[in-house]
């Protein structure tokens, strides 16, 4: 998490920042949204806690022709050690249910936001 | 074009059975993972169960486990929906659907009513 250029700076951006964006982002899907976001597509929930980044990438990463998250994908690698591809699904992403990516993104955004407040930015 | 028609829907008693069907066209069927979901009247759409391509890997909400069976026949391009010991709750528009894909690769619903 020391290597995440690309997202708003050219160089390294620090932990802390990078969670910051990815929240701003979240939060601009969120309230900018006026048809279901990605009009109704739905997705695997996932467990909130380990691998979550990389469990969050291979949910969304599956959704195409959604430009609303493409920037929220992208900013998900950054997070992911290892490349993610669509269909993939690691050992800690338990296929028991499909929310609208609408709730997945405020699920995640709440979640987010309290690991940034508790200061838990890898 | 995608195109996915459901059938099968109707009104049947507490208990009883209905097998839904969805006919699929414009895409190749068999390379693709297809989700049933349900809308109840005044109600969010709600997830009932997936199939991988294969028909291999099956997946089911809670709510229908153990009384809902999901199928596909890949050389009929159809998906299925086996209901039993259906309950009130279960009245909905149920939808075929791509899956990971946008209301443009939904079916038009086919309505079951579950009531005496």
């Known amino acids: 998490l020391t290597c995440l250029g690309g997202f708003a700076s050219p160089g390294p951006v620090p932990p802390s920042t990078a969670l910051r964006e990815l929240i701003e982002e979240l939060v601009n899907i969120t309230q900018n949204q006026k048809a279901p976001l990605c009009n109704g597509s739905m997705v695997w929930s996932i467990n909130l806690t380990a691998g979550m980044y990389c469990a969050a990438l291979e949910s969304l990463i599956n959704v195409s022709g959604c430009s609303a998250i493409e920037k929220t994908q992208r900013m998900l690698s950054g997070f992911c050690p290892h490349k993610v591809s669509a269909g993939q699904f690691s050992s800690l992403h338990v296929r028991d249910t499909k929310i609208e990516v609408a709730q997945f993104v405020k699920d995640l955004l709440l979640h987010l936001k309290k690991l940034f407040r508790e200061g838990q930015f890898n | 074009e995608v195109q996915l028609l459901e059938s099968g829907g109707g009104l049947v008693q507490p208990g009883g059975s209905l097998r839904l069907s969805c006919a699929a066209s414009?895409?190749?069927?068999?390379?693709?993972?297809m989700d049933w979901v349900r809308q109840a009247p005044g109600k969010g759409l709600e997830w009932v169960s997936s199939?991988?391509?294969?028909?291999?890997?099956?997946y089911y909400a809670d709510s229908v486990k153990g009384r809902f069976t999901i199928s596909r026949d890949n050389s009929k391009n159809t998906l299925y929906l086996q209901m039993n010991s259906l309950r009130a709750e279960d009245t909905a528009v149920y939808y075929c659907a791509k899956a990971f894909s946008t209301f443009d690769y939904w079916g038009q619903g086919t309505l079951v009513t579950v009531s005496s």
């Open positions: 199939i991988d391509n294969s028909g291999f890997s099956t």
């Open positions: 414009g895409f190749t069927f068999s390379d693709y993972e």
